[in-house]
């Protein structure tokens, strides 16, 4: 689920935007895989990647830059 797409009906929260990261619909959704931007308190959470927020679980999640792995993209992928 590391890939993200733009969606025109997302209230301005568009995947790929540096500030917003991933799409969040205006209506509350409980399905897994529904993301919004991370709270700004997590701006340094992802070491080598970008942060997105799992809405249903209220948890941050990292989408790692190429060549990095780990929950916070903190490790170099030796197999990359």
């Amino acid at each position: 689920d590391g890939n993200s797409t733009r969606s025109p009906e997302t209230n301005g929260l568009l995947c790929g935007d540096p500030e917003e990261n991933c799409a969040a619909t205006t209506t509350q959704s409980k399905r897994k895989g529904h993301f919004s931007r991370c709270p700004k308190q997590y701006k340094h959470y992802c070491i080598k990647g970008r942060c997105r927020f799992v809405v249903a679980e209220q948890t941050p999640s990292c989408v790692c830059d190429e060549g990095y792995i780990g929950a916070r993209c903190e490790r170099v992928d030796l197999f990359y």
């Epitope: 929260l13 969040a24 509350q28 919004s36 931007r37 709270p39 700004k40 308190q41 997590y42 959470y45 809405v55 209220q58 948890t59 941050p60 916070r72």
Partner: antibody, heavy 121, light 107 residues
């Protein structure tokens, strides 16, 4: 059931320090963020700072930076808030509050009973 | 810091009334907002988290809505035990900040 039990009321002189404790039971203490929130008589709620699990350290509101220290002792499941250079405006009820998140500071779902700190000469 | 402004600061209502409290953030906070109820001499109690999610054990007459900068707490039918002070709180960024509170009194 999570419970946060705070230490008793304190009366302090201006210029002195106070250390309030908050003992947790019924949950995994080290997993959650503990914050301290104060409330002056007849006033609203004011976040002072808190320990952020993913950072492994405390973050403080600028207003209290340099005057407040928030620590935790995992062996006793107790959090502490020490406020120094006390002045009369610091007279307030001090609450510890647990964040609902094991990552950062989100909603405060459990609160201590409050500790009244009175600063008076 | 993100400023949170509640309105009204106080209101008088009767049992059975529909009550609406608003909270405005000084900048967009997405839906990173919580609502609390506080009674005199007691610690605050979490009612709503993430703008619209009802905390476990909280009566369904409480509801929250909004995103961005404007948020609303609604009590659909005010009960005697609902007379209290209500606070909003943002958790988008440090420092966490609260609204100044809205006191709901008996008319």
């Amino acid at each position: 059931q999570v419970q946060l039990v705070q230490s008793g009321a304190e009366v302090k002189k201006p210029g002195s320090s106070v250390k309030v404790s908050c003992k947790a039971s019924g949950g995994t203490f080290s997993s959650y963020a503990i914050s301290w929130v104060r409330q002056a008589p007849g006033q609203g709620l004011e976040w002072m700072g808190g320990i952020v699990p993913w950072m492994g350290e405390a973050v403080y509101a600028q207003k209290f930076q340099g005057r407040v220290t928030i620590t935790a002792d995992e062996s006793t499941s107790t959090a502490y808030m020490e406020l120094s250079s006390l002045r009369s405006e610091d007279t307030a009820v001090y609450y510890c509050a647990r964040s609902s998140s094991t990552y950062g500071i989100h909603a405060f779902d459990y609160w201590g009973q409050g500790t009244l700190v009175t600063v008076s000469s | 810091d993100i400023q949170m402004t509640q309105s009204p600061s106080s209101l008088s209502a009767s049992v059975g009334d529909r009550v609406t409290i608003t909270c405005r953030a000084s900048q967009s906070i997405s839906n990173f907002l919580n609502w609390y109820q506080q009674k005199p001499g007691k610690a605050p109690k979490l009612l709503i988290y993430a703008a619209s999610n009802l905390q476990s054990g909280v009566p369904s007459r409480f509801s929250g809505s909004g995103s961005g900068t404007d948020f609303t707490l609604t009590i659909s039918s005010l009960q005697p035990e609902d007379f209290a002070t209500y606070y909003c709180q943002q958790y988008d960024d440090f420092p966490m900040t609260f609204g100044q509170g809205t006191k709901v009194e008996i008319k």
